[in-house]
Interface confidence: low
């Protein structure tokens, strides 16, 4: 099984111990650690972080103590802007020039392939985002033409039905990425107005969204039902939870709400906790299982979160390997608890440890 | 009771076109579940024709054999579901069967919780 | 499209026999096997779900197994009510149901 990890390089940023450089990773964890995110920039693929390059080469010295471990970049994310990438993929010229750039890019830096971030294309990009899926893996077979070893291309994709609907041609762009990650998470958020878990497996009988979609089985099977191969679909299990603040004393699923819950002492962003937040957040909590949902969730004053801990990803992975899927993939590394200080395991990366174990058992 | 109630079939001529009807009681149609029809020619296993997610979503599936002629509908307020066929053939000849999926999760795959008795559509000149 | 090939079309046994039904489905369908039994004039009846779960209410003496492309079906002591005819369907997509349905398996006295 594939187990595709996400760095992120502003995780550097974060302050004191929430501060992760990719020397902190741990080389024989995933089979692939995806870089995050790479810029585009007069249609050329580009650097983002002014120490990006430098970040670059740690990541991928990783591989001179283990030559399985395959590295991507990834490029677009949140603040590249759908736009941008709407200009280059639907204009031929800078499509062409986009696509020329990234292989050499790819190749001084070190990396094994490329993963696509358009997050998400328009309703009118559909057919122009499986053209640039479609010109980049002809470019990247061409490209390996001498003897080299193929570059791969993946693409994270929503999870979200009405996304899937409007921006994918899955049945086309399956034939041509090596891999498919499917981010399921973030199915519920602040703008709801209740309580609710932002990765659930199931849509479980507790689910108070008024749809069927917004959990982890409806938009595996509907990506299968689509023509994604389950041997291309990596599944994506999140390192973080999404958090409430309660608007009253009711506490359960559906609870009513009057925001996102309050900023991480380290990420630093309302409604959003890095799983070693969370670890913190647990001292003095209550915990409840959804059942239905196999998933956790946490409460104290008025702060209610939604999370994985190792239990719940563990029926994910269960789950995955019933469905016969790819593998799983996490976002991300430096959201889970790196240094194995937060959560009294004396264990780094314990989440993405348990979703390694989990794959390996028989 | 939970139930499910086919009627509408009888002797139709080939090209011709029927509607068939499946009233449920005990749960309601716009609830979280696939309705299919599955049919049976005399003497022969069982054959799929498509499901429809009766929920909020417009899902629907059919079989090639079907598509373009048979179309799956709802009715909310009567609680029915809809089997409408056209340029129906000799080879359509079958008991028409409505079946319930098992509603609110994926888990174990999809199977067919729920029955009807079955109509019986005899196309014949 | 995802075909099932159940086996035997027909057998012959006797009141307290063990028999056993298999179907084999043309691509993997991971545990998303279902089994039905049918008696003449009658619906369908859900007998076992994902592979090996017992529906409500189905006596024990059946049992289910197999992951991927191979299951089988199992009734561990024939009773006279077992006399049925069996059919196989994959649960897995929604998508390559043509047709989802094995043949049957048709269980006779002997």
């Known amino acids: 099984y594939k187990l595709v990890c996400y760095y992120t390089s502003w995780s550097q940023y974060r302050e004191g111990d929430g501060s992760c450089f990719p020397d902190a990773l741990d080389r024989f964890l995933c089979t692939h650690i995806i870089y995050s995110f790479a810029n585009i920039s007069n249609d050329h693929i580009d650097t983002w972080e002014w120490n990006d390059v430098t970040l670059y080469g740690m990541l991928n010295t990783l591989k001179n103590r283990n030559p399985n471990l395959k590295t991507l970049l990834s490029v677009g994310g949140w603040n590249f802007g759908s736009q941008r990438f709407s200009k280059i993929a639907s204009n031929t010229q800078s499509r062409r020039t986009f696509i020329k750039s990234v292989p050499p890019f790819l190749r001084t830096h070190g990396f094994d392939g490329l993963d696509l971030a358009w997050l998400y294309p328009g309703r009118r990009d559909k057919q122009h985002f499986t053209t640039l899926i479609k010109e980049m893996k002809a470019e990247f077979i061409k490209e390996a033409q001498p003897g080299k070893k193929q570059l791969l291309l993946s693409a994270a994709l929503s999870a979200g039905k009405v996304t899937i609907d409007s921006s994918y041609d899955i049945a086309k762009i399956s034939q041509h990425l090596d891999f498919i990650s499917i981010m399921t998470y973030d199915f519920h958020g602040a703008w709801r107005g209740t309580t609710g878990h932002h990765s659930p497996l199931f849509r479980g009988q507790e689910d108070a969204s008024p749809d069927r979609f917004s959990n982890t089985d409806y938009a595996v099977g509907y990506m299968l039902r689509l023509g994604a191969p389950a041997s291309k679909l990596v599944m994506g299990i999140p390192t973080f939870g999404r958090s409430f603040t309660l608007a009253s004393s009711e506490t359960g699923v559906g609870a009513p709400i009057s925001g996102p819950g309050i900023p991480g002492r380290f990420t630093k962003e309302a409604g959003t906790l890095a799983y070693y937040e969370i670890c913190d957040f647990l001292r003095g909590a209550t915990v409840h299982r959804i059942l239905g949902q196999q998933v956790p969730y946490a409460t104290k004053g008025n702060q209610w979160v939604g999370y994985d801990d190792q239990e719940s990803v563990k029926s994910k992975v269960q789950y995955l390997k019933d469905r016969q899927l790819a593998g799983a993939m996490v976002w991300a590394l430096d959201l889970d608890d790196f240094q194995g200080s937060f959560c009294g395991q004396d264990l780094r990366f314990p989440l993405t440890n348990a979703i390694k174990d989990a794959l390996a058992a028989t | 009771e939970v139930q499910l109630v086919e009627s509408g079939g009888g002797l139709v001529q080939p090209g011709g076109s029927l509607r068939l009807s499946c009233a449920a009681s005990g749960f309601t149609i716009s609830s979280d579940y696939y309705m299919c029809w599955v049919r049976q020619a005399p003497g022969k296993g069982l054959e799929w024709i498509g499901c429809i997610y009766i929920g909020s979503g417009t899902d629907t599936y059919y079989a090639d054999s079907v598509k373009g002629r048979f179309t799956i509908s709802k009715h909310n307020s009567k609680n029915t579901l809809y089997l409408q066929m056209t340029s129906l053939r000799a080879e359509d000849t079958a008991v028409y069967y409505c079946?319930?999926?098992?509603?609110?999760?994926?888990?174990?795959?999809?199977?067919?919780?729920?029955w009807g008795q079955g109509t019986l559509v005899t196309v014949s000149s | 499209d995802i075909q099932m090939t159940q086996s035997p079309s027909s057998l012959s046994a006797s009141v307290g026999d063990r028999v056993t039904i298999t179907c084999q489905a043309s691509?993997?369908?991971?545990?998303?096997l279902n089994w039905y039994q049918q008696k003449p004039g009658k619906a369908p009846k859900l007998l076992i779900y994902?592979?090996?779960s017992l529906a409500s209410g189905v006596p024990s003496r059946f049992s289910g197994s197999g992951f991927g492309t191979d299951f089988t079906l199992t009734i561990s002591s024939l009773q006279p009510e077992d006399f049925a005819t069996y059919y196989c369907q994959q649960g897995y997509s929604y998508v390559d149901l043509e047709n989802g349905f094995g043949g049957g398996t048709k269980v006779e006295i002997k």
């Open positions: 691509q993997s369908i991971g545990k998303y």
């Open positions: 994902s592979s090996s």
């Open positions: 079946a319930r999926d098992k509603g609110w999760s994926n888990a174990w795959g999809f199977y067919f919780q729920l």
